[in-house]
């Protein structure tokens, strides 16, 4: 470092140093003053400091804390912000397998109900995306929907494939004993259970990666008060004023300084803790019906088995359905 | 543990899954967030400690400033003096958070609260039998969280199946399947998604 | 380990220039801003210039304006003042100092010095 200076008469170095902040000279005094209008740098002597040189150095130690606080969070706001766009992507692309290993499932070995599968099971996996994505949708209503329309193709192309036009009108009432006879069996109670768990795990998981980033956005935007910009002011510039170019803060008192300014931020600590172990337990139960990758991927296996249940019992359900959805009945089951 | 094997058998006909050996799954991934978001466990307490590392300090110096003069480094006056004359320090604490702030504290106690309900301990959630008017179904055995579904010839157990740097091809593109064709079979390939999503860091 | 070490002082004639030079290393240079000060004999330090960390920004004190240029390479961790027609109060020694994230705040590290002497 350099050797200290002697006593300077003239405030010619505070003028050079001001200049790094402020082009021109108009604000700093050409020799010592009393200071007796400055709010911060209090003088124990004449000083060459002015009040708009203070205001200046606030200003400035504010914009100086908010950068440092932006440096300091830019690695966990990247982390979290990535991650949020990865998992996200990540989810999507299972949901397209899924539906892709669901048509391909009825391709293979119900090629008569294709047309209309197809267009079920696109349905379908669009509200479970619309779902993951924080949409008001009913996990339970998605299943229904999903086998209260299969049905009715199952029972005309499958279980009834000589059907006449005029029967097609029967509809309703096929989607009506769909549920009352349960003839998928258990098959879209499981269903729902899986896809419920599954899904409401993993849309409550991107909520919480979404909310970290909100929390570090929110801290690394926040606007430091007067009280803090005149601490932090004291510490880095008031030093100038009395000639003092090249001496630092004391480090406790850096730490003081720091730990008053950022008195409010502080209190999120708490709650940031528990943020993260709560995420980490999250994740550590997703697995099995809690995976969405897992049942979502395993879907097309269980719609086939229910489809395979419904054909087991045809005979029976034909028959029973034959009766409840004759034309004198079939109002009720509007 | 749950299986995904090689060739599905449907009805007889093969669905052939692409064997992937590449094990970065979703659920890998989402334990590396983790263990990377526990090292800024305690970001939050220690950005004071942080911001003066990253902001000048007197480390080697011999004397230091205290926002009033000139102290030795080690000496009462370098954390204390500095203070006297400040506005009350206890007062700046007093004043508590400010609006945002507690409005992410109330935010972050919302999901907090969520993901605990979430995570509770998981008891048995499947009925084990899964048709209560008689018809034959297939039995899921004890472990009933892990039966994807089951009837007559067996059931399929389904390991997690979308790896990271690989994409399971099909080699029909269903969205256009003619609705007449007999039979479909996947090529043993693998297609890379997740190229572009980088890994995080 | 920071360290800068300046370079390129020495006797000149009036209204005839100069280069300093200052290594540095054991930092990530090309993300740091670096000024130029001067101590003139018996007197107190003046600072003269400083540059960013991409070497876009430049800004010089008043009495150096238009005769001093600050420059960088980063690919050689090299900071450079350039000094075009000198004067005899420019005598001084020179110091390159890293600046810290905290603006026109005190200096990080500093250099041991280079002498210029501006005499005829």
């Known amino acids: 470092q350099p050797p200290p200076p002697p006593p300077d008469a003239t405030c010619h170095q505070v003028r050079s140093f001001f200049q790094r902040l402020q082009p021109g000279l108009k604000w700093v005094p050409e020799t010592p003053v009393p200071g007796s209008d400055l709010q911060v740098c209090l003088p124990k002597g004449p000083t060459c400091c002015s009040r708009k040189m203070e205001e200046k150095y606030q200003l400035t130690a504010r914009l100086n804390m908010e950068q440092l606080l932006q440096s300091a969070s830019m690695e966990l706001k990247f982390l979290i912000i990535q991650n949020a766009a990865v998992f996200q992507e990540a989810f999507e692309i299972v949901v397209r397998h899924a539906k892709n290993y669901t048509n391909a499932m009825f391709k293979n070995n119900y090629p008569s109900l294709t047309p209309q599968a197809f267009e079920f099971v696109g349905e379908f996996f669009t509200d479970v995306s619309l779902y993951i994505l924080g949409s008001d949708i009913n996990v339970d209503d998605m299943v229904n929907e999903l086998f209260d329309s299969l049905f009715p193709v199952i029972y005309t192309q499958l279980m009834n494939p000589g059907l006449p036009d005029s029967a097609l009108d029967i509809n309703e009432c096929l989607r009506g004993a769909r549920r009352d006879l349960k003839v998928f069996g258990n098959f879209p109670k499981l269903i729902m259970t899986q896809v419920s768990k599954s899904l409401q795990v993993t849309r409550i998981f991107l909520q919480a990666l979404n909310l970290g980033i909100e929390v570090i956005n929110t801290t690394d935007h926040l606007k430091f008060s007067k009280d803090c910009g005149r601490m932090l002011t004291r510490m880095w510039y008031c030093s100038y004023c009395q000639g003092l170019m090249m001496v630092k803060p004391c480090g406790g008192y850096c730490n003081v300084v720091m730990q008053g300014c950022m008195a409010g931020v502080v209190e999120i600590d708490k709650y940031w803790r528990e943020y993260i172990l709560s995420l980490e337990e999250l994740v550590n139960g997703m697995y099995r019906i809690y995976d969405m990758e897992n049942v979502l991927l395993g879907l097309f296996s269980t719609i086939h088995d229910s489809i395979q249940y419904v054909q087991k019992n045809a005979g029976k359900l034909t028959t029973t359905i034959g009766k409840l959805c004759a034309h004198s009945q079939q109002r009720q089951y509007r | 543990s749950a299986y995904y094997p090689e060739d599905l058998f449907i009805d007889k006909k093969v669905l052939k899954v692409a064997h992937v050996e590449h094990e970065e799954t979703l659920s890998s991934r989402r334990r590396e967030l983790i263990q990377k978001l526990k090292s800024f466990i305690s970001f939050y307490s220690a950005l004071p400690g942080y911001i003066c590392s990253h902001s000048p300090v007197a480390e080697n110096d011999t004397l230091c400033w205290n926002g009033q003069e000139l102290v030795e480094r080690y000496s009462q006056k370098a954390a204390r003096n500095g203070m006297k004359n400040q506005f009350n320090l206890h007062e700046l604490k007093m004043k508590g958070p400010e609006p945002v702030v507690s409005q992410i504290i109330d935010k972050l106690k919302h999901i907090n609260q969520l993901l605990r309900t979430m995570s509770m301990p998981k008891g048995r959630v499947l009925d084990k039998n899964l048709d209560e008017e008689g018809f034959e179904s297939g039995d899921c055995g004890d472990d009933e969280d892990e039966c994807i579904g089951g009837s007559g010839d067996g059931m399929i157990k389904v390991k997690n199946q979308l790896r990271f740097l690989a994409e399971l091809a099909y080699d029909l593109d269903v969205d256009d399947a003619p609705g007449n064709s007999q039979q479909a079979t996947p090529k043993d390939n693998e297609i890379s998604t997740f190229h572009n999503l980088g890994n995080v860091h | 380990q920071v360290q800068l070490v300046e370079s390129g002082g020495g006797l000149v004639q009036p209204g005839g220039s100069l280069r300093l030079s200052c290594a540095a290393s054991g930092f990530t240079f090309s993300s740091s801003a670096m000024s130029w000060v001067r101590q003139a004999p018996g007197k107190g330090l003046e600072w003269v210039s400083a540059i960013s960390g991409s070497g876009g920004s430049t800004n010089y004190v008043d009495s150096v304006k238009g005769r001093f240029t600050v420059s960088r390479d980063n690919s050689k961790n090299t900071l450079y003042l350039q000094m075009n027609r000198l004067r005899a109060e420019d005598t001084a020694v020179y110091y390159c100092?890293?600046?810290?994230?905290?603006?026109?705040?005190?200096?990080?590290?500093w250099g041991q010095g280079t002498t210029v002497t501006v005499s005829s």
């Open positions: 100092a890293k600046e810290s994230m905290v603006r026109g705040g005190p200096f990080d590290y």
